[in-house]
Amino acid sequence: DPASKSRSCGEVRQIYGAKGFSLSDVPQAEISGEHLRICPQGYTCCTSEMEENLANRSHAELETALRDSSRVLQAMLATQLRSFDDHFQHLLNDSERTLQATFPGAFGELYTQNARAFRDLYSELRLYYRGANLHLEETLAEFWARLLERLFKQLHPQLLLPDDYLDCLGKQAEALRPFGEAPRELRLRATRAFVAARSFVQGLGVASDVVRKVAQVPLGPECSRAVMKLVYCAHCLGVPGARPCPDYCRNVLKGCLANQADLDAEWRNLLDSMVLITDKFWGTSGVESVIGSVHTWLAEAINALQDNRDTLTAKVIQGCGNPKVNPQGPGPEEKRRRGKLAPRERPPSGTLEKLVSEAKAQLRDVQDFWISLPGTLCSEKMALSTASDDRCWNGMARGRYLPEVMGDGLANQINNPEVEVDITKPDMTIRQQIMQLKIMTNRLRSAYNGNDVDFQDASDDGSGSGSGDGCLDDLCSRKVSRKSSSSRTPLTHALPGLSEQEGQKTS
């Protein structure tokens, strides 16, 4: 009945106006629809311009909905990252504060004369944790070498120790084990603990980064057409009350988000690996136990050096010759009191357990984020019909939606009736993000085995995939030691969402 409400375009007028468009475009009554390029060409309340405006609007609305969903996930990952990062940094800072508070009393000048070396060690550990491409074992070895050189001079102020003698001392050091078992123990435990902590936090950063970048991938023109048809063609065709059929909506969004769904497998792998590596946070080589107790290993090392002084000196003289005695120099340093050791195992504070259980639950919740996205957006954003009945909008008219729902991912869209998807042309941004997920998963798996992927031999088992250098966003820096000739810079990108802290000022 041309005189009925739906034929008069009143409802369309209301909806169109509410979206901020000019009402002068809207016909008073239905017109012939041969001009329509997206909606079925029956009688319509939409002009060409209206159709174009609504197509652009539906496209923007879907992109906004997509970004909103991504933002919620990003915010969760960023909160997790910040919480874990704060906790791990707090553990290390606590250890350094304890060292600064207790070592002067425990070791006197053996500490105060070497305060800078200890500060440097903590700075290097901090840099390593924050993603700097430095070799932790090498860093620790250099620290012990420098410390031995300095302490040996302090313990023998009566000896003239020129640089060549100190070089000889350095060469002897490994065989002499001047600091007892502490360096070896710290190396083994710290490597595992720091690798686990940093790779977990990096994993959160990479996941967040992937979500952010994927949310910026534009929806193609075929998707725009399909979404317009899904959301606004019912209005144009005079059935504005008809809500989209659920399966119809799913097919449209599965077509639109086909590339995003291809993230699913590697996304799950990453989250699984992250959940798995939290096992490494506990026990005697666990993150909390080790990172919070670096100072106790250092104390143990200095005590061992004092205990072994005479034997060590004899062996050094045997290997490097008799150093000249300075006639003006004082006698050998008196044996100092042993530095009292705090218990090596930090009692767990409970903070990390709480963080881990929350993280595990949240990571499990978002495991199927990419494949559930079409369903989520349909149910939350598209005002679907409550049932697949014959009263819902099926893209052509009110009625049942008959096609089957497509599978997930690009390959499964070959016969998608709603969106023309070229399955031979995957989105390159999303492929790159899949690669980033693979690289990070590979890092986490290596970290689980106690290895730092940045410094594994090229003669690895060949498994895994990725760029081969474990670097993200092509922001690699080079490893360095005093013996090599390159430079080292922190990879701030390794923890997206955290800016690199500047070097500390002290006075």
Epitope: Q113, D120, E124, P162, R482, S487, T506
Partner: antibody
Amino acid sequence: QVQLVQSGAEVKKPGASVKVSCKASGYTFTGYYMHWVRQAPGQGLEWMGEINPSTGDTTYNQKFKARVTMTRDTSTSTVYMELSSLRSEDTAVYYCAREKRDDGVFAYWGQGTLVTVSS
Amino acid sequence: DVVMTQSPATLSVPPGDRATLSCRASQSVSSRLAWYQQKPGQAPKLLIYGASTRATGIPARFSGSWSGTEFTLTVSSLQSEDSAVYYCQQYNDWPRYTFGQGTKLEIK
């Protein structure tokens, strides 16, 4: 061989800032601390502070702490010393100096940069 | 801060003679003392570290010694090129390294 090459002489007005650079070569840049020492005309040497090129950590002489900033660029093996709120008594030759080994002994020196502060 | 006091302010010695320069620390700096030589218009040059160890390439006529907080730089058989200002520096008190005010050595 170890070389430290500093930027050229500067003339500044009181209240301004100056940034002096020191480019290192001939050794592993990140392996040794770099220090800045200044010498006013006809005066002695005064230690201003140090930077660890590996970590960026800095330690400043209390006297300059509010006005000095030391930074480094590992990609170019260069350290920088910026002094702000200049006054006439900051007129001096500014030297960068590299430690001998991990010890606070200045074995290698730049050629010096004369900074003149004058209105 | 550790104050380093050098004496004399100026020392005038004939060539071939021995010059003895002194440096006193206001508190113990162990043997962590270095000596530098500075010629006009040049950067300082390291001579001695560890109070008595000669730096690489420094001739044997330069020697250092110490007793307690008193440090001495001795230049034997002086040559005209030894004319310079000599500074002592303590590096015991990190992070407050301090220099003496310098001794000007003139060759008569």
